[in-house]
């Protein structure tokens, strides 16, 4: 999103149609002055996966050429703010969080792809992306509006051994059922086919001369 000053001057530019060359010059000269604030964009809502993983993109419009960027994820719930994770990275390098961090991420230009793991229903809340351009000076701060992450806990899993027994019993049952079904079907088929077993196949001449390679068998029952 362009900064507010930019939008205001854009509106003025639309009004000043007759004096557009002057206005355009003014507009071009003053864009750098009015667009110094750093804006951070992030999705409004994200639903965590059943495994408690949520991913979202945090994008910032950089007003300067930063070489060192700090990204912090904050969680806001019930007016309480806590730091989820933070990482400082050099532009062009990989984003590295601490080993014990629940966050992982990758950076690409002015975009940071963040993934938060190990989330549970109680972790539902507003996750705010804070970007700071640390080096070289001047320092710039950008705070996103936040991504509401919804986490739904999966149904509690029964004991794994018990689950294996159930799985084994079900698969065995299905195997025997399919085996039985196959046997019954085969026996029925054989019974139906029994009066047709005595017969001979006779090779007939082709109906059309060009189809010499095609043979049409004709079944003649023998009483």
């Amino acid at each position: 999103m362009a900064c507010l000053g930019f939008q205001r001057h854009k509106a003025q530019l639309n009004l000043a149609t007759r004096t557009w060359p002057c206005t355009l010059l003014f507009f071009l000269l003053f864009i750098p002055v009015f667009c110094k604030a750093m804006h951070v964009a992030q999705p409004a809502v994200v639903l965590a996966s059943s495994r408690g993983i949520a991913s979202f993109v945090c994008e910032y419009a950089s007003p300067g050429k930063a070489t060192e960027v700090r990204v912090t994820v904050l969680r806001q719930a019930d007016s309480q703010v806590t730091e989820v994770c933070a990482a400082t990275y050099m532009m062009g390098n990989e984003l590295t969080f601490l080993d014990d961090s629940i966050c992982t991420g990758t950076s690409s230009g002015n975009q940071v792809n963040l993934t938060i793991q190990g989330l549970r229903a109680m972790d539902t809340g507003l996750y705010i992306c804070k970007v700071e351009l640390m080096y070289p000076p001047p320092y710039y701060l950008g705070i996103g509006n936040g991504t509401q992450i919804y986490v739904i806990d999966p149904e509690p899993c029964p004991d794994s051994d018990f689950l294996l027994w159930i799985l084994a019993a079900v698969s065995s049952g299905l195997f025997f059922y399919s085996f039985l079904l196959t046997a019954v079907s085969l026996s029925k088929m054989l019974k139906k086919r029994s009066p047709l077993t005595t017969g001979v196949y006779v090779k007939m001449p082709p109906t059309e001369p060009e189809c010499e390679k095609q043979f049409q068998p004709y079944f003649i029952p023998i009483n």
């Epitope: 002055v33 009015f34 604030a37 703010v81 080096y135 320092y139 950008g142």
Partner: antibody, heavy 120, light 108 residues
Framework: QVQLVESGGGVVQPGRSLRLSCAAS????????MHWVRQAPGKGLEWVAV????????YYADSVKGRFTISRDNSKSTLYLQMNSLRAEDTAVYYC?????????????WGQGTLVTVSS | EIVLTQSPGTLSLSPGERATLSCRAS???????LAWYQQKPGQAPRLLIY???SRATGIPDRFSGSGSGTDFTLTISRLEPEDFAVYYC?????????FGPGTKVDIK
């Protein structure tokens, strides 16, 4: 409760040096950015410098750049301001303040200040 | 650097009246990064508003902040005797973190 106590102020001659200290208590010092803000007698507030949590990043006002150095000792919960090549215009009450955690550097707690007078 | 201008320089009002203080920036300041402070004689400043409109801990709801871009406002809905002081705005979106020159609210 949060407390910030400045010390080290006094009268000093132009061109000389002075070191200010700020002892912090009542909060986890190493989690916060810390600032120095000054106020000349009868004048408004002027931001001087900031130092990040770990001391790696420091930023200064143009008027003090190259003369003042901000530093911190997290083990002692103390903030410092080393002032070199002092000028008459550096005469002010120097406040140590804490950056509001998370949402940028608005200053939520301030010390009572220490007066620095640069005079010959 | 971002230069902040405050108006009026002095505001003379009576207790119970509404005070409207203005802060204008030379460049666009995201609304997330503007703060207001109150300072009484012989005291350190006190944070009132951060993020242009969020009240700091313990600040009464008669204080409210608004604005975006380059124009910001601090409103005191009903002046109490303890509200007569100097008010400063500050931007912290980019370094150097500048303050405005202040607006003095005194008793008429």
């Amino acid at each position: 409760q949060v407390q910030l106590v400045e010390s080290g102020g006094g009268v000093v001659q132009p061109g000389r040096s002075l070191r200010l200290s700020c002892a912090a208590s009542g909060f986890t010092f190493s989690n916060y950015c810390m600032h120095w803000v000054r106020q000349a007698p009868g004048k408004g507030l002027e931001w001087v410098a900031v130092i990040w949590y770990d001391g790696r990043n420091k930023y200064y006002a143009d008027s003090v750049k190259g003369r003042f150095t901000i530093s911190r000792d997290n083990s002692k919960s103390t903030l410092y301001l080393q002032m070199n090549s002092l000028r008459a215009e550096d005469t002010a009450v120097y406040y140590c303040s804490r950056g509001l955690l998370w949402f940028g550097e608005s200053l939520d707690y301030w010390g009572q200040g220490t007066l620095v007078t640069v005079s010959s | 650097e971002i230069v902040l201008t405050q108006s009026p320089g002095t505001l003379s009002l009576s207790p119970g009246e509404r005070a409207t203080l203005s802060c204008r920036a030379s460049q666009s300041v995201s609304s997330s990064y503007l703060a207001w402070y109150q300072q009484k004689p012989g005291q350190a400043p006190r944070l009132l508003i951060y993020g242009a409109s969020s009240r700091a801990t313990g600040i009464p709801d008669r204080f409210s902040g608004s604005g975006s871009g380059t124009d910001f406002t601090l409103t005191i809905s009903r002046l109490e005797p303890e509200d007569f002081a100097v008010y400063y705005c500050q931007q912290y979106g980019s370094s150097p973190f500048t303050f405005g020159p202040g607006t003095k609210v005194d008793i008429k």
